[in-house]
């Protein structure tokens, strides 16, 4: 069986087993044939007529091989005393099993009195003469444990007390717990303990590319079975468990820490160039911020903000913009404003200086608007709004920015007051409005700001017009939009008009003209 090591197996011996028998006329060494008429060797005794039989059959010396407890598996047939005439007083149906330990082969010089009795063995099934037909002999198998053993070897002996008995085979074996890997710990084979209840503690060694989570231990039972696994090993970073081993993460996969988890596919925009990767390297132009976990996707700096518009009010300017179309895969976007003063031309600009005031602040702006005050009157300014995220400072590329140029003055146009809808289609709306009451100069253009209702913070669009009417196209059918208009002069932009809501036409259903 699995986990059993044979010290003796007579079924593998061809011919006489060479055992010691005494006295004479007791046990006989006899070659028989089995049920299939194959030759087998047996030891038989059938001294059933005389009382007080005491016939001994002793094995050769069996080296212990380190076993503390061994098992004797005896296969035998025993004839029913009732099948033999006239022997009821003298015939027995049991025999005794004994053992003797010694540190060397004692040859023929062993004595009955030295042996220790293991057990009296009876047949589960004896047979009568009627069972002999077609050699249907009832084979009995009995197993007995012997131990604890301490000397280098031992003998087993069968004592016949008057039975009609044939010993067909004897297998002496010890049990061991087989070498195995459990919880990624390798346990070497272990010989079982000295008695039937003992447990032998064995410490496991972590397999290659694994490490202890808790000290791995198991206990080898007397039956040769591993019991009570304690502790375990886990695969190291870069390795995952596969069939009791730790295998390197394949290309394109990684594992950042020791543990039970499997290798994970590299996050988006990253790769592993070698097996057993503990992290995945970011693709070109993608980065991982210092606090990003290895499981986070690699990201890149955002594109420039869009729809940057300015509103000049004397020596102040309000800047508004929409978030970048490409946030770079991150949500931690803030904005920085760069102010440049251009006294002569837009090609010759300089920093605005410390007197300029930014509300709420110049850098790390969370919202997409800014008031810049304390500007010089009648001065050209260039404002750059750059979007920044958690990896912008890791990129060597210059930051993308939206630019707006303005000229300060003392008076921008007043608010456009009257605005009305001229026509609304499914995807377009035509608007009409009046000039501001105080243009404060020549109106250079009008700016129409529009967005889906309640979505101004998410996205809005602008359109420029040079007259007091405009058609806004590319709208969604059946959708409510908000429109605002303002005028721009060389002095800057006026305030936006009050919001006007218009709903685009619903799409007409198609009619099936088939009959």
């Amino acid at each position: 069986g699995r986990g059993e090591v044979n010290l003796l197996d007579t079924s593998t011996i061809h011919g006489d087993w060479g055992w010691l028998t005494y006295p004479a006329h007791g046990w006989d060494s006899i070659n028989e044939v089995d049920e299939s008429f194959r030759p087998i060797h047996t030891y038989q005794v059938c001294n059933v007529m005389s009382p007080n039989q005491n016939n001994w059959l002793r094995t050769n010396w069996v080296p212990r091989d380190g076993a503390r407890r061994v098992y004797a598996e005896i296969k035998f047939t025993l004839r029913d005393c009732n099948s033999i005439p006239g022997v009821l007083g003298t015939c027995k149906e049991t025999f005794n099993l004994h053992y003797l330990e010694s540190d060397r082969d004692l040859g023929a010089s062993t004595q009955e009195s030295q042996f220790l009795k293991i057990d009296t063995i009876a047949a589960d099934e004896s047979f009568t003469g009627a069972d002999l037909g077609v050699r249907r002999l009832k084979l009995n198998t009995e197993v007995r444990g012997v131990g604890p053993l301490s000397k280098r070897g031992f003998y087993l002996a069968f004592q016949d007390i008057g039975a009609c008995l044939a010993i067909l085979s004897l297998r002496i074996y010890y049990k061991k717990c087989p070498a195995m890997v459990r919880n990624l710990a390798a346990f070497s084979e272990a010989v079982t303990g000295a008695d039937s209840s003992s447990l032998v503690e064995v410490r496991g060694q972590c397999v290659r590319h694994s490490e202890e989570r808790d000290t791995p231990k198991m206990y080898c039972s007397a039956e040769g079975e591993w019991l009570v696994p304690i502790g375990k090993c886990v695969c190291s970073a870069g390795y995952e468990e596969r069939r009791d081993a730790c295998m390197a993460c394949e290309l394109g996969f990684y594992k950042s820490a020791p543990g039970d988890q499997l290798c994970a596919r590299c996050p988006p925009h990253s790769h592993s160039a070698t097996p057993a990767a503990q992290t995945c390297r970011c693709d070109l132009s993608y980065y991982r911020a210092a606090l990003d976990p290895p499981s986070a996707a690699c990201t890149r700096p955002p594109s420039a903000p869009v729809n940057l518009i300015s509103s000049v009010n004397g020596t102040s300017v309000t800047l508004e913009w929409a978030p970048p179309l490409d946030p770079g895969g991150r949500s931690d976007i803030t904005y920085n404003a760069v102010c440049r003063r251009c006294p002569w031309a837009l090609s010759h600009c300089e920093a605005c200086g410390s007197g300029t005031r930014f509300v709420p602040q110049q850098t790390s702006l969370a919202q997409a608007s800014l008031l810049v005050a304390n500007l010089l009157a009648h001065m050209n300014y260039s404002f750059w709004i750059e979007a920044v995220n958690g990896v912008s400072n890791l990129s060597p590329e210059p930051r993308s920015a939206a630019v707006v140029n303005i000229t300060t003055n003392q008076a921008a146009p007043s608010q456009v007051v009257v605005i009305r809808q001229e026509r609304a289609g499914q995807t377009s709306v035509s608007l009409l409005w009046q000039e501001p009451e105080q243009p404060n100069g020549i109106i250079l253009e009008y700016e129409i700001k529009y967005y889906e209702k309640d979505k101004e913070m998410q996205s809005y669009s602008t359109l420029k017009a040079v007259t007091t009417r405009a058609t806004v196209s590319g709208l969604k059918p059946g959708t409510r939009y908000v429109f605002q208009v303002r005028a721009r002069t060389s002095a800057g932009c006026g305030r936006f008009s009050q919001a006007m809501e218009v709903e685009t036409g619903k799409p007409r259903p198609r009619y099936d003209t088939r009959t």
């Epitope: 059938c46 007529m49 006239g86 003469g129 037909g133 009609c164």
Partner: antibody, heavy 121, light 106 residues
């Protein structure tokens, strides 16, 4: 070696008695039963019965009761067949044979050389 | 009592040939059957017991089989010393012999 030794030929008159000895050697006499077999001239074998050498208890086959007696003297390892009131049809060779019981079956494994008993007036 | 019938009464074979002897019981004797060989002027010799078991010293050219009521003794290659009379014997509660089969030289 194991052997059974029987006495020489006997010639008896009708009505007389004869006691045929069978001396065993080479084994423990009381460990094996002893059987008796008759073979009339030119005829086959006839089993007469057997005796338990340990208890002395005899078993007789049909047709061999009354005039035939099995007995023992274990001190000299000898079995005896006594036939009384001899008849002419008792003329035969009488064999003693050791009975062997085994796990796999029984048989008469050792035979004496036979004693010819002739009954003639 | 159980009656054993042997056939044939006489079997003529040449040395080296195969000889097959039969023994039939009037009722089942299971495997409680023995075979004996008897040469002229000699005591019988046990050849087989337990229907098929050969005692130590019996040549392996002798083999036997059967159970219940039909039994066979086979001599695979008859040797000159095998010419003799062969008896079967059952050992139930009462023992009986068959009448014998004579194996003679052809």
């Amino acid at each position: 070696q194991v052997q059974l030794l029987q006495s020489g030929a006997e010639v008896k008159k009708p009505g007389a008695s004869v006691k045929v000895p069978c001396k065993a050697s080479g084994y423990t006499f009381t460990s094996r039963a002893m059987s008796w077999v008759r073979q009339a001239p030119g005829q086959g074998l006839e089993w007469m019965g057997w005796i338990n050498t340990n208890t002395g208890n005899p078993t007789y086959a049909q047709g061999f009761t009354g005039r035939f007696v099995f007995s023992l003297d274990t001190s000299v390892s000898t079995a005896y067949l006594q036939i009384s009131s001899l008849k002419a049809e008792d003329t035969a060779v009488y064999y003693c044979a050791r009975v062997r019981f085994t796990v796999y079956g029984d048989g008469m494994d050792v035979w004496g050389q036979g004693t010819l008993v002739t009954v003639s007036s | 009592e159980i009656v054993l019938t042997q056939s044939p009464a006489t079997l003529s074979v040449s040395p080296g040939e195969r000889a097959t002897l039969s023994c039939r019981a009037s009722q089942s004797v299971s495997s409680n059957l023995a075979w004996y060989q008897q040469k002229p002027g000699q005591a019988p010799r046990l050849l087989i017991y337990g229907a098929s078991t050969r005692p130590t010293g019996i040549p392996d050219r002798f083999s036997a089989s059967g159970s219940g009521t039909d039994f066979t003794l086979t001599i695979s290659r008859v040797e000159p010393e095998d010419f003799a009379v062969y008896y079967c014997q059952q050992y139930g509660p009462s023992w009986t012999f068959g009448q014998g089969t004579k194996v003679e030289i052809k």
